[in-house]
Amino acid sequence: EKSDYGNLTLAEDTNIGSTILTIQATDADEPFTGSSKILYHIIKGDSEGRLGVDTDPHTNTGYVIIKKPLDFETAAVSNIVFKAENPEPLVFGVKYNASSFAKFTLIVTDVNEAPQFSQHVFQAKVSEDVAIGTKVGNVTAKDPEGLDISYSLRGDTRGWLKIDHVTGEIFSVAPLDREAGSPYRVQVVATEVGGSSLSSVSEFHLILMDVNDNPPRLAKDYTGLFFCHPLSAPGSLIFEATDDDQHLFRGPHFTFSLGSGSLQNDWEVSKINGTHARLSTRHTEFEEREYVVLIRINDGGRPPLEGIVSLPVTFCSCVEGSCFRPAGHQTGIPTVGM
């Protein structure tokens, strides 16, 4: 009915789903048939697909709606052309003419928008032993209006990080520790400089890669180890070592040795596997008392760390396989026999 709907001015933040224009065409064919039904299509001026047209089948009214956000920065003025056509093909020899087309001019006005981060989340991986002042990552944002951006961190509760306000580069300012929990997540804020100081928030996730910073130790409490005295034959016991490092590519491979040379006449230690070793007596001539055997455990890491642990072993008289002590003789009677 109308071929030019004139100018339509909208702010770029107009809600998706909004009806911005009502259009009407007529068809002289029999009502409520495929011949008279009208479909509207935008054929020019909306290559981004920001607009759509819904048709009321009873009235053949078309409603132009916003399908995607309008954007002043990429398309301030658009000359929109749409076509009204039947869902059924026209009879042979009849063509759509100029009256089947209409147009309007969409003018989008600028609205100051917050900066936009290039990613929803920024992730970086860094070894936990990095030197203070090391760059551990960076974030980037752009302001749609082209304003400068200032970056800041929020929620750096461990006090590990600082951000360059201009470049978005993130640096360590304190020793990092994977054992405190990884990933370490903080918020990054981008604020436009000038304008209305609008800001937006993203996240920075720092994944801490383990380094060898925990010395080996005994995997459990080995108090209460005993041998029955006197020994009838050399005896042995098995113990397990562990550490608190994360062994990403293979399990721990500890090596074991006696902690001092003076122990070598009485004891020997032999590796069973990467985590277990056997402590054996070299003879049977031990006194009826507690011996503290020092064991040196090396983790073979980079750098290698060593722990010296003590295994208390008691030689005691036994009754039915358990240590026997006269009443009141001593406290802390060993309970684990080997």
């Epitope: 929803h120 929990g181 918020q187 996240e203």
Partner: antibody, heavy 119, light 113 residues
């Protein structure tokens, strides 16, 4: 849509190794972590480990550090898990699962491969 | 490692009833850096792989019916099904995605009477 395709079953001998595959489609493979999860019959879920296909960084559950090795082939958008020195304890369903958008929950799961260790 | 404990291990409910199940964490899952709770819930129907229902403790995965509601903060979390349906018969798992290694609870099995 996102799809993670896994073979249905593998039967292996005790002491042998098996390499499970997970072919991803419907998203950019290098943008998301790939996780592997074990489920024994009638039991809960256990996280084995994860790999970031963008740089092949791996993170393992300590319990599986000597059992599983995770790799990826970015050219075919495929993730792999090799299980070694298999015992009856390794008989289970193994799922691959893609990380979520912006964090580390498991947004998409494969159908799982049933591994049976039997002589 | 963070230990996740789910209860009850199983429960049987009639269609239309309200269901609640609990998940407790051995460590705080609320990040002071982002103010998010890093807890997810999954539904696993018999013979199928798990399907995500909830992440960040209360954010529903797209396509999940709104009868599934995640709540809680810190160490105590709840999955509520406001009006249980026959198709909700499944094993429900919680998982912390706060710190490596990611860990799951033992599961809650929901049966329909």
């Amino acid at each position: 849509q996102v799809q993670l395709q896994q073979p249905g079953a593998e039967i292996v001998r005790p002491g042998a190794s098996v390499k499970l595959s997970c072919k991803a489609s419907g998203y950019t493979f290098t943008d998301y972590w790939m996780n592997w999860v074990k489920q024994r019959p009638g039991q809960g879920l256990e996280w084995i480990g994860a790999i970031d296909p963008s740089d092949r960084y791996t993170n393992y559950n300590q319990k599986f550090k000597d059992k599983a090795t995770l790799t990826v082939d970015t050219s075919s958008s495929s993730a792999y898990m090799q299980l070694s020195s298999l015992t009856s304890e390794d008989s289970a369903v193994y799922f691959c699962a893609r990380g979520g958008y912006g964090d580390y929950w498991f947004a998409n799961w494969g159908q799982g491969t049933t591994v049976t260790v039997s002589s | 490692d963070i230990v996740m404990t789910q209860s009850p291990s199983s429960l049987a409910m009639s269609v239309g009833q309200k269901v609640t199940m609990s998940c407790k964490s051995s460590q705080n899952l609320l990040s002071s850096g982002t103010q998010k709770n890093y807890l997810a819930w999954y539904q696993q129907k018999p013979g199928q792989s798990p399907k995500p229902l909830i992440y960040f403790a209360s954010t529903r995965e797209s396509g999940v019916p709104d009868r599934f509601i995640g709540s809680g903060s810190g160490t105590d979390f709840t999955l509520t099904i406001s009006s249980v349906q026959a198709e909700d018969l499944a094993l429900y798992h919680c998982q912390q995605h706060h710190y490596f290694p990611w860990t799951f609870g033992g599961g809650t099995k929901l049966e329909i009477k």
